[in-house]
């Protein structure tokens, strides 16, 4: 326990001290005090360097004194014969005696007292960096204005830390710049910019003067920049030794300025600014960037537009452009989006045609549609070649995205009709000679197929039966054969509006406008035994001249039979209308003068008894196309006649082409009534 004073006496004092003694005393006074040790009596065997007997005074590791011999006071007013003053609060006193004493020695008497020390002046090392203030039992340090006392309570520094700079541009300087900076300070400045900006520091050489490095090259005062795991510096000396532009590649920078106790210089001044993070100019295939720039930085937005034929796809939908932003991490957003070739998909099938399986359905691929030849041809041209276009559609140079249409080839029989075997008034024929021939079983009559959905016949055939049963594709109309042929189901019958409907059709004398159309429920599939006949053109080339030959076919009455089972046909010339007028009506139902003859009728026949007859009605009078000799067109329809085997009258189809086309056009979609 520390004490303020005390007494120390040699063993047996004031009697003689014994031989061979070693005794020590540890003196301790309170902290902040020194020790005044004084001897009032000293009588110890004298020897050189006090080698035999001695009293030793030790402070720490230092011997303050070693005493022996006799002493008396020099001052008559003071009993002190020897004294020690130490500025420490601990002291050790050690007394030693050897094995013999030639005389009787009484030893020593000593006293110690705690004395105040002036820590501010008594030591070589000044305890305070700035102002030292002594008081009894201690001292305290204080600082000049604008300085503060560090936690060690000894050192003063300036309050230069804690500043956080968030502006995109700024200036930072050492304290008091350009006056000398404070000693013994650690200044920390923080720059914290928004993510997406990197701190760039700019220093001028002349704006930097910091105490130079020591002989080992270590900076005594130093400026250091820390950006994440990168450090720039330490820097010191006269004139900035580092790069004048420091690109930190970080949005956060710590600036640390450390000074020691000596050598103050003017310090430093720097400027900083936030540079937006750059994003790389990436090479994105099959696309263009807008705007195009040499350098892209944080917050720049580009529109990436795919080149024609390329798109960005997500799931089942796509887009031709997207936006990408240069982000705070120096990378582009939407970098996963890539322009890939447009996929036109599997081409749509077409009726009566086909498309070969494409090797690829991607942009630029080519496909070819073909029609089922020789029964169908491509009506809307374009050659059938389509390429996968940039908009994802299969496109033809002529039709664009419209699909080709395979329509039946008209007027071309698979086998030409040859009059081989002469039958009375005609020849046996095969359905392949007249693939357009339609058979009506009630009434027994004929018709002509003109396309997939329409049959042309005479009005008088269908006026009594608006739901006729029709057959195509069979030479024979025996029941067993018809069962194997194609039956056509009517959807609607259209009789020419000029055809006069009678209550008693048997007494008819006016066959003007004897023409009708039957719309079929389902399209007819064409082939070698079923294909349509052409309609006449509207030009004068299709005006018939007397003597022009035409073919008629049907299962009507022959000389031998009322009805034919196998198809018959004959080649007849066109005759003047008067020839028909001159023939006496076989079984007149009225006065001969009552029969009406009009320009809507063609007269034909009169050669070798070849003629159409009852049961052939509605069948086509087929004439070779003047503009294409390989084709036949329906110049007429079997209508009526004065007498079988002479001349017959046929509805002049050319006069009805407009009505036929209009009727078909207006009723092209299946009716729902």
């Amino acid at each position: 326990e520390p004490t303020m004073y005390g007494e120390i006496l040699s063993p047996n004092y004031p009697q003689a001290y014994p031989s061979e003694v070693e005794k020590s005393w540890d003196i301790e006074v309170p902290e902040g005090y020194g020790i005044h040790l004084y001897f009032t009596h000293l009588d110890i065997e004298l020897s050189e360097n006090c080698a035999y007997d001695s009293v030793q005074i030790i402070s720490g590791d230092t011997e303050e004194g070693r005493l022996c011999g006799q002493r008396s006071s020099n001052n008559p007013h003071s009993p002190i014969v020897e004294e020690f003053q130490v500025p420490y609060n601990k002291l050790q006193v050690i007394f030693k005696s050897d094995f013999s004493n030639e005389e009787r020695f009484t030893g020593f008497a000593a006293y110690y007292v705690a004395t105040d020390i002036n820590e501010c002046t008594d030591f070589v090392d000044v305890p305070c960096s700035h102002f030292c203030n002594n008081f009894i039992g201690g001292y305290f340090c204080s600082c000049p204005p604008e300085y503060f006392l560090h936690d060690d309570m000894k050192n003063c520094g300036v309050n230069c830390s804690g500043d956080v700079f968030t502006a995109l541009i700024g200036e930072i300087a050492s304290p008091n710049y350009p006056k000398p900076y404070p000693e013994n300070s650690r200044c920390e400045y923080q720059i914290r910019l928004e993510k997406g900006f990197q701190v760039v520091v700019t220093l001028r050489r002349e704006d930097f003067d910091v105490e130079a490095a020591d002989s080992a090259g270590n900076c005594l005062d130093s400026l250091v920049f820390v950006a994440g795991d990168r450090q720039f510096g330490p820097y010191c000396g006269h004139g900035f030794p580092g790069p004048l532009n420091i690109e930190t590649k970080s949005n956060a920078l710590d600036i640390i300025f450390q000074t020691d106790l000596t050598g103050q210089k003017k310090g430093w001044k720097l400027r900083y600014h936030g540079d937006p993070m750059p994003c790389p100019k990436e090479d994105t295939p099959n696309s263009v960037w807008e705007p195009a720039k040499a350098k892209y930085v944080f917050r720049d937005v580009v529109q990436i537009t795919c080149l024609d034929g390329f798109e960005v796809v997500e799931g089942r939908v796509g887009a031709t452009s997207f936006y990408s932003t240069c982000q705070s991490n120096g990378k582009w957003s939407n970098s996963k989006l890539k322009c890939q070739p447009v996929d036109c998909g599997i081409p749509e099938p077409i009726e009566n045609g086909k498309v070969e399986d494409p090797e690829s359905t991607l942009f630029g691929s080519v496909i070819r549609y073909t029609c089922e030849e020789p029964y169908y041809y491509m009506e809307n041209g374009g050659g059938g070649e389509y390429h996968c276009a940039g908009n994802g559609s299969w496109v033809n140079e002529v039709l664009g995205p419209e699909l080709p249409k395979c329509v039946p080839v008209c007027g071309v029989p698979r086998e030409p009709f040859e009059e081989k075997q002469r039958i009375i008034g005609g020849s046996d024929a095969d359905i392949k000679n007249f693939p357009w021939q339609v058979f009506f079983d009630n009434p027994w009559a004929g018709g002509a197929l003109i396309n997939e959905y329409w049959v042309l016949t005479a009005a008088h055939v269908v006026e009594g039966n608006r739901e006729p049963t029709m057959y195509v594709g069979s030479t024979s109309v025996q029941t067993s054969r018809l069962a194997k042929s194609k039956m056509l189901t009517p959807e609607h019958v259209f009789i020419h509006p000029g055809w006069k409907l009678l209550e008693v059709p048997e007494g008819r004398t006016n066959f003007d406008n004897d023409i009708a159309l039957v719309r079929l429920k389902d399209p007819v599939k064409m082939g070698p035994t079923v294909s349509p006949i052409c309609l006449p053109g509207t030009s004068s080339d299709y005006n018939l001249m007397d003597g022009d030959l035409g073919l008629i076919s049907g299962w009507g009455r022959t000389e031998k039979r009322d009805r034919a089972v196998r198809l018959k046909a004959a080649r007849l010339p066109v005759a003047p209308l008067r020839k028909c007028k001159e023939v006496k009506v076989e079984k007149p139902t009225a006065d001969a003068e009552a029969y009406v003859f009009t320009p809507n009728m063609i007269c034909a026949g009169g050669e070798k008894g070849m003629d159409s007859c009852k049961g052939d009605s509605g069948g086509a009078f087929a004439v070779q196309d003047p503009n294409d000799k390989t084709k036949f067109y329906a110049a007429g329809l079997v209508s009526w006649g004065p007498q079988c085997g002479t001349y017959g009258l046929y509805t002049r189809v050319k006069n009805y082409v407009d009505w036929i086309m209009k009727t078909m056009q207006e009723n092209s979609t299946p009716r729902e009534d």
């Epitope: 937005v301 960005v312 997500e314 887009a319 936006y323 932003t325 990378k331 970098s335």
Partner: antibody, heavy 116, light 107 residues
């Protein structure tokens, strides 16, 4: 088919953290961005951030910067969102969503309740 | 950040009505705008992307238009299943911000 299945509802105390998972099936998350969007009760949608699971790049909305961490485990095809220092106003339904061009598929949502 | 403002906040309409919701961006977002529909207790569903493209499976009565800062979502003839909350969202630049929503209610 494409599905995003999120972890179950959580109740947390203020100051705690929550980690919500989003397991993807029917596609590889490395080919898409995985976003997190939250919706406070009776409030609108609020975008929090996204991750590119291919390279672990993340972008966060400034509001959540420092509090949110979005991660992805490509081996399990799962994305995660961790929100720390929770406060009562973080009570919301948290959705994950997949995108390239747009947010075409969303998780069913995870209700996180923050209450003392 | 880009702010997205929808109007109206709520709207009452009847089945068969034609309805228009508008969305305004605080800065140009070109055509990088999507529309979502959300019903109570459900996740949002994408309706329109890139301002005017209908997402697959979305009925044709939904259409979007606009570019730059002004956008509209139109429902040509309201059906009972269309009563929900609709949100616009810009994907022009991060953060991808949403409008505050428009609640469509039965009159």
């Amino acid at each position: 088919q494409v599905q995003l299945v999120q972890s179950g509802a959580e109740v947390k105390k203020p100051g705690a953290s929550v980690k919500v998972s989003c397991k993807a099936s029917g596609f590889n998350i490395k080919e898409y961005y995985m976003h997190w969007v939250r919706q406070a009760p009776e409030q609108g949608l609020e975008w929090m951030g996204w991750i590119d699971p291919e390279n672990a790049d993340t972008i966060y909305a400034q509001k959540f910067q420092g509090r949110v961490t979005i991660t992805a485990d490509t081996s399990t095809n799962t994305a995660y969102m961790e929100l720390s220092s929770l406060r009562s106003e973080d009570t919301a339904v948290y959705y994950c969503a997949r995108s390239r061009l747009f947010f075409a598929y969303w998780g069913q949502g995870t209700l996180v309740t923050v209450s003392s | 950040d880009i702010q997205m403002t929808q109007s109206p906040k709520s709207l009452s309409a009847s089945v068969g009505d034609r309805v228009t919701i508008t969305c305004r961006a605080s800065q140009d977002v070109r055509t990088a705008l999507d529309w979502y529909q959300q019903k109570p207790g459900q996740s949002p569903k994408l309706l329109i992307y890139s301002a005017s493209y209908r997402y697959s499976g979305v009925p044709s009565r939904f259409s979007g238009s606009g570019s730059g800062t002004d956008f509209t979502l139109t429902i040509s003839s309201l059906q009972p299943e269309d009563f929900a909350t609709y949100y616009c969202q810009q994907q022009y630049t991060t953060p991808y911000t949403f409008g505050q929503g428009t609640k469509l209610e039965i009159k």
